[in-house]
Interface confidence: low
């Protein structure tokens, strides 16, 4: 057992704020200290006139375990005209997604609505804020002139996000083009340099974005989940996205080229309504230097020996044997209605055996549905199908499940002991838990 | 042939019985005078031939007891079975399902009232009398009820613009009722006029995206037994009328709704009040609740999404799908044909697992065909009897906790067979 379950560091957020809905580590170059980033998308803020704007908190990985909100946006709604707000930040779910890379933090509000400049509407385009050191800029690529449901009006940009090594951001907007969904990628440098607080729809010269397709692709939700990894051997990270309602709800995962957003590869689920693509992750699990793909289908139903279907959840493990050549195995959940595969977190090499490891959550598993996180070790043949460790949620809640494991992030060594650590969110009890590896 | 019972140096009853199901232990301490303790462990037949009285031999036995004295079931017999097993042993019994000639029928119309459905709803005004006449041929004591649904009343599924929030149908030039998750409009009644009045009063509503909140509404209609007025003795039909696919459980994350559906009834003043705070049910959850509540679902679907519902059927035991023609002209025939199909199918499902015990259920159909219990028999008439051969195998004894009984449930029937498992794991 590598993760210390005896004395994890527990962080509590504002009650009812969904603190723990999104988690990441933060390692600014300006500080020797490490931090956790925790999204609390229903938190109240000091923004004037805004109810439950949501926030991201920066928590110290020291014994103080102090968490402080990061100020990205202190303003209320801007006005288009008198008594005619341009935007609607109440209940915008800021902090529903958060990612960091070195000094940069990207955090988003996928339920941010705006009026549009053409006519008085209320469309959930979504918005994000990018902080790089002392600089904070807004990034709302779906707040464009392409309004309404058939455009980007319902995009919900920032529903899922990631950074690439080459300093691009990847953003998922599952509602674009009548919910076909969309991926958008922009360069961090350009997002910062192009920012103008007086311009609501900023054009980015180096933007990569998927386009609208035929109506049969409506209601697919491309951009529901995202990850990055190199899948064509060019050394540039490509874009992986879950599309859980695609293929008539069998669900799909699309991989797009990180250079030009052309299609590289697709995976299709095998059971309707299993929500294949709810979560995606990419990491080399078998030590062959090719990124492998992990896809969660938390509502997958397995047919037992008696023929009865039981909803246990499933994770597809697609090993990349050579460039673009995948071999897929399936890992089923262990408990009914536990939603195994809701979150998948690459852990780095947790047990220092030369192979990367992975965490898979079943947020409604275990005693009293307190949530479980399974640790699976990598090996040369792929993923060991028997978990090496199971982390158990420790909180019960009356009004909603704790959802321990709904969000996770690993592969970062906060205590610098040579072993990568893991942070697990439990938004139903407004908690995040840091498990240190040893 | 190797005798594993007598070969080991066994000095305790418990150890002896672990060696194999054929082994026995003579409880007489002086058995085989001067011999070692191991002589008290042997095959049961050897112990008898060596002179140990039968009533002094401990061995693991297999018993199946079905009691017919207190039998209250009329369609599914036996109602209760007791099975005593030891590890490695199996027991068999027969379960009999005999459908009634004519059932009381409760038919609840659950109608998607989003704007694209307005043509189909018009047809509902006139279904009552004609349908009750047709159903009288196959059922008795026919009742109708009605409920409407649209979708979760939050962005991005509806427009939250203040001018449109209560009337989503401005584009359809319809005077719309506000959008809603699910409203129970009329409890099951034999008063056809009342049904037609309720349907006539029904206004169309609307929303933005294509999929609707049908699974939310279905689950509420299934579990809110007293509100709907489902009768225990009736065949319960839930007719879901729509032209679009349904939202899935995790779709509602788009709206910031991330609390799993708890599967309970949440109607207040006949309105589903957790629509905006709880996810849609998953297909697995929905299936479980429909079966638990003996609900047979009929999807009556207009348009190309009929195939989506048809493809769902293998994941929803007891459900069937029919295609509605333009303006729902064939709706009554669709219901009658669906009902005939429902009562002609007998399938069983194991409701709960017993740790360490495996069930194998085989249907023996009236035509002699043998099929897995979950597939069951089709074309069963009201005079037929369907037999299910149930084999129970016990794998292991070292089980902590869990249930010590299983329920075998014919899908859509209000009777079950309870199988009590008694583990024979040690010496008395």
């Amino acid at each position: 057992f590598n993760l210390d379950v005896e004395s994890p560091a527990e962080y509590a957020g504002p009650e009812g704020s969904y603190f723990g809905f999104a988690v990441d580590f933060f390692e600014p170059s300006t500080s020797s200290r490490m931090f956790l980033l925790v999204g609390a998308p229903k938190a109240n803020t000091t923004q004037p006139g805004i109810v439950e704007g949501g926030q991201v908190l920066k928590c110290e990985c020291s014994s103080s375990r102090r968490c402080q909100p990061i100020e990205f946006d202190s303003t209320g709604n801007r006005d288009y005209a008198k008594d005619d707000p341009l935007e609607f930040k109440s209940h915008q779910w800021f902090g529903a997604s958060v990612r960091s890379k070195q000094d940069k933090i990207l955090a988003c509000a996928p339920l941010y609505h705006w009026r549009t400049e053409m006519k008085q509407e209320r469309e959930p385009v979504g918005t994000c804020f990018l902080q790089d050191g002392t600089k904070t800029v807004e990034y709302a690529p779906c707040r464009s002139k392409n309004i309404d449901a058939d455009g980007q009006g319902f995009c919900q940009g920032g529903f899922s996000i990631d950074f690439t090594k080459a300093d691009r951001v990847l953003l998922g907007g599952p509602g674009s083009f009548y919910w076909q969904g969309q991926l958008i990628s922009d360069q961090v440098a350009e997002i910062i340099s192009k920012y103008d607080p007086n311009v609501y729809s900023i054009k980015y010269n180096n933007q990569l974005a998927t386009r609208t397709a035929q109506a049969i692709f409506d209601d697919s939700y491309l951009g529901y989940s995202v990850a990055v990894g190199d899948f064509n051997g060019d050394g540039i990270e490509d874009f992986v996205s879950g599309v859980p309602r695609a293929a008539r709800t069998l669900g799909m995962v699309y991989i797009y080229d990180g250079k030009n957003m052309s299609s590289l590869h697709n995976f299709t689920g095998e059971q309707m309504a299993a929500y294949f693509g709810f979560s995606v992750a990419a990491t080399d699990i078998n030590g062959d230097d090719y990124a492998d793909v992990f896809i969660g289908a938390p509502l997958f139903m397995d047919r037992g020996s008696d023929g009865k279907l039981q909803e246990v959840g499933q994770v597809s493990v697609s090993l990349q044997r050579a460039v673009g050549d995948f071999q897929t195995t399936k890992l089923n959940g262990f408990e009914v209605f536990a939603r195994f595969g809701s979150a998948i977190a690459p852990l780095g090499d947790l047990d220092q055996d030369g192979f990367n490891d992975i965490a898979i959550a079943a947020p409604y598993g275990g005693e009293d549905k307190k949530g479980l996180v399974y640790i699976f070790n990598g090996r040369s043949t792929g993923l060991n199908s028997v978990p090496s460790q199971i982390l158990e949620g420790q909180w019960a809640a009356q009004s909603m499940p704790p959802s321990f494991g709904y969000s996770m992030k690993g592969a970062t060594d906060v205590d610098r002991n040579g072993y990568p650590d893991l942070v697990v969110g439990a938004f139903g009890v407004d908690r995040a838990v840091l498990y240190r590896a040893r | 042939e190797h005798n594993r019972c007598g070969s080991a140096n066994v000095v305790s009853c418990a150890r002896c019985l672990q060696l194999g199901p054929e082994c026995g232990w003579c409880v007489q301490e002086d058995f085989v005078s001067g011999g070692s303790g191991s002589e008290r462990c042997d095959t049961v037949s050897s112990l008898i031939s060596k002179g140990c009285p039968v009533d002094s031999i401990e061995y693991l036995s297999v018993h199946v007891v079905t009691s017919s004295e207190n039998e209250i079931n009329t369609q599914v017999t036996p109602g209760e079975v007791s099975v005593q097993l030891h590890p490695g042993a199996e027991a068999n019994f027969m379960l009999k399902v005999r459908p009634l000639k004519k059932y009381p029928v409760d038919l609840y119309y659950l109608v998607d009232v989003s704007a694209s459905m307005h043509n189909n709803i018009e047809k509902l005004n006139s279904v009552g009398n004609d349908l009750s006449k047709k159903m009288a041929l196959y059922s008795r004591d026919f009742r109708l009820g009605f409920g409407s649904y649209v979708d979760k009343t939050v962005s991005p599924y509806i427009s939250i613009h203040p001018e449109r929030i209560h009337n989503q149908c401005s584009d359809y030039n319809l005077d719309c009722m506000p959008p809603h998750g699910y409203i129970h409009v009329l409890s099951l009644t034999e008063n056809i006029t009342e049904f037609e009045k309720a349907v006539h009063r029904q206004k169309i509503s609307g929303n933005i995206d294509t999929p609707e909140g049908g699974f939310d509404a279905m689950l509420q209609a299934a579990v809110c037994e007293s509100h709907i007025g489902w009768r225990k003795e009736a065949k319960r039909l839930l007719l879901v009328m729509t032209d679009q696919t349904s939202h899935l459980a995790l779709d509602s994350k788009l709206a910031g709704i991330v609390v799993p559906n708890d599967g309970n009834c949440h109607l207040k003043n006949n309105v589903y009040v957790k629509s905006t705070t709880m996810e849609h049910p998953s297909l697995g959850q929905l299936s479980e609740k429909l079966i638990d509540n003996n609900i047979n679902v009929i999807f009556a679907v207009q348009g190309k999404q009929f195939h989506w519902y048809k493809d769902l059927l293998p994941l929803l035991p007891g459900a069937i799908a029919g295609e509605i023609e333009s303006k729902a002209a064939n709706l009554n025939n669709l219901v009658v044909e669906a009902y005939k199909k429902i009562i002609s199918e007998v399938k069983v499902q194991l409701e709960n697992q017993v740790h360490g015990v495996h069930f194998n259920i085989t249907a023996i159909c009236p035509d002699g065909a043998r099929k897995p219990g979950i597939s069951g028999c089709g074309n069963v008439t009201s005079n037929d009897e369907v037999l299910f051969n149930v084999t129970v195998v016990m794998k292991t004894c070292d089980i902590m906790g869990g249930k010590n009984y299983a329920i075998i449930k014919p899908i859509g029937f209000n009777e079950t067979t309870k199988v009590h498992i008694h583990r024979s794991c040690s010496c008395q």
Partner: antibody
Framework: QIQLLQSGPELKKPGETVKISCKAS????????MHWVKQAPGKGLKWVAR????????TFADDFRGRFAVSLETSASTAYLQINNLKNEDTATYFC?????????WGQGTTLTVSS | DIVMTQSPSSLAVSAGEKVTMSCKSS????????????LAWYQQKPGQSPRLLIY???TRESGVPDRFTGSGSGTDFTLTISSVQAEDLAVYYC????????FGAGTKLELK
């Protein structure tokens, strides 16, 4: 922040009935069960009962079954402890509390004096 | 019912001294699944409501000074105050939440 505000002191005669209230604020009332704890003068804490604020289901400690009742007025975010047929030994301070790590909160206590 | 026994019933100390007090339960409070001991320590000053110090036998509630330490597992638990301050004079109660709730009789900490 979370606050539990209890009703004022009570002076009662043996055989009478008392109803103590506990008004909650600063959190969703139905999120946590409400507990009641007794502390007789100069004595220790004794757990009396809890009520599930979502379902209204009560649970009592063995010593407090019979004369003690707990109830809710959810719309007012208020819980009640009622003691019937009062006895001298009911003289004590009664606390309402929610027990939840990180959010453990107690009312200020209600002093009940039972004397003839 | 689980019975909680605290000792000593009172303790006279000087400021700066290290203090330990004991709490024993009539049955184990360790949940083998969660590996948590469901035992908490409370401090109560005269005329005040109790205040949570420690939960899960050894986890300090936020805002509680680090001179308070909880230890033990199963049926035997200890609260240690590494260097008693004047403001620590109070009654200390242990509470189990393994099965319903019950409190110990308390340990009174007073000045010598």
């Amino acid at each position: 922040q979370i606050q539990l505000l209890q009703s004022g002191p009570e002076l009662k005669k043996p055989g009478e009935t008392v109803k103590i209230s506990c008004k909650a604020s600063g959190y969703t009332f139905t999120d946590y069960s409400m507990h009641w704890v007794k502390q007789a003068p100069g004595k220790g804490l004794k757990w009396v009962a809890r009520i599930n604020t979502e379902t209204g289901e009560p649970t009592f400690a063995d010593d407090f079954r019979g004369r003690f009742a707990v109830s809710l007025e959810t719309s007012a975010s208020t819980a009640y402890l009622q003691i019937n047929n009062l006895k001298n030994e009911d003289t004590a301070t009664y606390f309402c509390a929610i027990f939840y790590y990180g959010r453990d909160s107690w009312g200020q206590g209600t002093t009940l004096t039972v004397s003839s | 019912d689980i019975v909680m026994t605290q000792s000593p019933s009172s303790l006279a100390v000087s400021a700066g001294e290290k203090v330990t007090m004991s709490c024993k339960s009539s049955q184990s409070l360790l949940n083998s699944r969660t590996r948590k001991n469901y035992l908490a320590w409370y401090q109560q000053k005269p005329g005040q409501s109790p205040r949570l110090l420690i939960y899960w036998a050894s986890t300090r509630e936020s805002g509680v000074p680090d001179r308070f330490t909880g230890s033990g597992s199963g049926t035997d638990f200890t609260l240690t105050i590494s260097s008693v301050q004047a403001e620590d004079l109070a009654v200390y109660y242990c509470k189990q939440s393994y099965n319903l709730l019950s409190f110990g009789a308390g340990t009174k900490l007073e000045l010598k």
